[in-house]
C-alpha cells in the first residue's frame, strides 16, 4: 500500500508508481540506458526528499479522465 | 562504452583524509544517483554513501555519517568522496556505481582504488 | 532497512557439478534482486538481474529464480572459471542498496 509523505525509491518506486498511475502508466522509460530528463525530475524529488500523492501523479502519463 | 574510474587511494594515518574520485563517461552522469560501496579485505560488499542527480541531496551509512562528504561535479561528469577522521575500519577498496533510482541493478564498475589506514 | 542473507557462506565444489546459492531477504522485495560474481582482485560483475534474467554476454549455465523474500543462483554445470565469491543484492529500496554477505565456491 502507498505509505505518503516518505522517500521512495528503487523498485519500490516503480511499484508505486504502477499503483498510483495504474493504466495510465508513467514517465520514464528502462533500462536504464534511457533515462529521461522527466524521469530524472521524480528520482531528485522521491528519491531523496518526501513524495506524496500528488507528486507522484505529476509523472502518471496522461490525466485520469473525469467522471 | 560505460567507464567508471576510481582514482585517490592510498596509504594514511588514523584521523587523516583522503579525497576519492570517480570519472564518468559513455553515460549522461546527470542523470544517475551515484553511490559508493567499499569492501574491507576478505569481506563483502558495503553501501557508503548517495548522492542525487542534482548533488543536491546526499545520504550516508552510519558507519561514516560526520566524517565522510560525497559530491558531484557534473560539468566534469566527477564523483568526489572526501573521508575525513579516518580509522583502520575504513580499509577498503572503494567502488563507485551508478544507480538510475528505479530498481536497475549496478550494471557498471569501476576497477576500485584501495584505501589503507594504518599507523 | 531491508537485510540479505546469503548460503552457505563457502562450499567446495568440482567442475561439472550443480551448485546452488540462496539468498533470502528479510522482507519483499518482489523481483528487485540482483547476483554479481566476483574474483579475486576485480570489481563485481553483474551476472543476472531482476531476480532471474542474464546479464548480456554470460553463460546460459547461469540461472536465477525466486520472487518476494526467496531467491536462488543456480551454476548447471560448474566450469573453472566459476571459482569465485557471489553476491546478491536488493535494489527495492534504494539509496542504501544492500549486498549480501557472499558465498565464496571453492575448488573441492
Known amino acids: 500500500a502507498y505509505r505518503p509523505s516518505e522517500t521512495l525509491c528503487g523498485g519500490e518506486l516503480v511499484d508505486t508508481l504502477q499503483f498510483v498511475c495504474g493504466d495510465r502508466g508513467f514517465y520514464f522509460s528502462r533500462p536504464a540506458s534511457r533515462v529521461s530528463r522527466r524521469s530524472r525530475g521524480i528520482v531528485e524529488e522521491c528519491c531523496f526528499r518526501s513524495c506524496d500523492l500528488a507528486l507522484l501523479e505529476t509523472y502518471c502519463a496522461t490525466p485520469a479522465k473525469s467522471e | 562504452e560505460v567507464q567508471l574510474l576510481e582514482s585517490g587511494g592510498g596509504l594514511v594515518q588514523p584521523g587523516g583524509s583522503l579525497r576519492l574520485s570517480c570519472a564518468a563517461s559513455?553515460?549522461?552522469?546527470?542523470?544517475?544517483?551515484m553511490t559508493w560501496v567499499r569492501q574491507a579485505p576478505g569481506k563483502g560488499l558495503e553501501w557508503v554513501s548517495s548522492?542525487?542527480?542534482?548533488?543536491?541531496?546526499?545520504v550516508y551509512a552510519d558507519s561514516v555519517k560526520g566524517r565522510f562528504t560525497i559530491s558531484r561535479d557534473n560539468s566534469k561528469n566527477t564523483l568526489y568522496l572526501q573521508m575525513n577522521s579516518l580509522r583502520a575500519e575504513d580499509t577498503a577498496v572503494y567502488y563507485c556505481?551508478?544507480?538510475?533510482?528505479?530498481?536497475?541493478?549496478?550494471?557498471?564498475w569501476g576497477q576500485g582504488t584501495m584505501v589503507t589506514v594504518s599507523s | 532497512d531491508i537485510q540479505m542473507t546469503q548460503s552457505p557462506s563457502s562450499l567446495s565444489a568440482s567442475v561439472g557439478d550443480r551448485v546452488t546459492i540462496t539468498c533470502r531477504a528479510s522482507q519483499s522485495i518482489r523481483n528487485y534482486l540482483n547476483w554479481y560474481q566476483q574474483k579475486p582482485g576485480k570489481a563485481p560483475k553483474l551476472l543476472i538481474y531482476?531476480?532471474?534474467k542474464l546479464e548480456d554476454g554470460v553463460p546460459s549455465r547461469f540461472s536465477g529464480s525466486g520472487t518476494g523474500t526467496d531467491f536462488t543462483l543456480t551454476i548447471r554445470s560448474l566450469q573453472p572459471e566459476d571459482f569465485a565469491s557471489y553476491f546478491c543484492?536488493?535494489?527495492?529500496?534504494?539509496?542504501?542498496?544492500?549486498f549480501g554477505p557472499g558465498t565464496k565456491v571453492e575448488i573441492k
Open positions: 548522492i542525487s542527480p542534482s548533488g543536491g541531496y546526499t
Open positions: 559513455g553515460f549522461t552522469f546527470s542523470a544517475y544517483i
Open positions: 556505481a551508478r544507480d538510475s533510482g528505479f530498481g536497475d541493478p549496478f550494471d557498471y
Open positions: 543484492q536488493q535494489s527495492y529500496s534504494s539509496p542504501g542498496i544492500t
Open positions: 531482476a531476480a532471474s
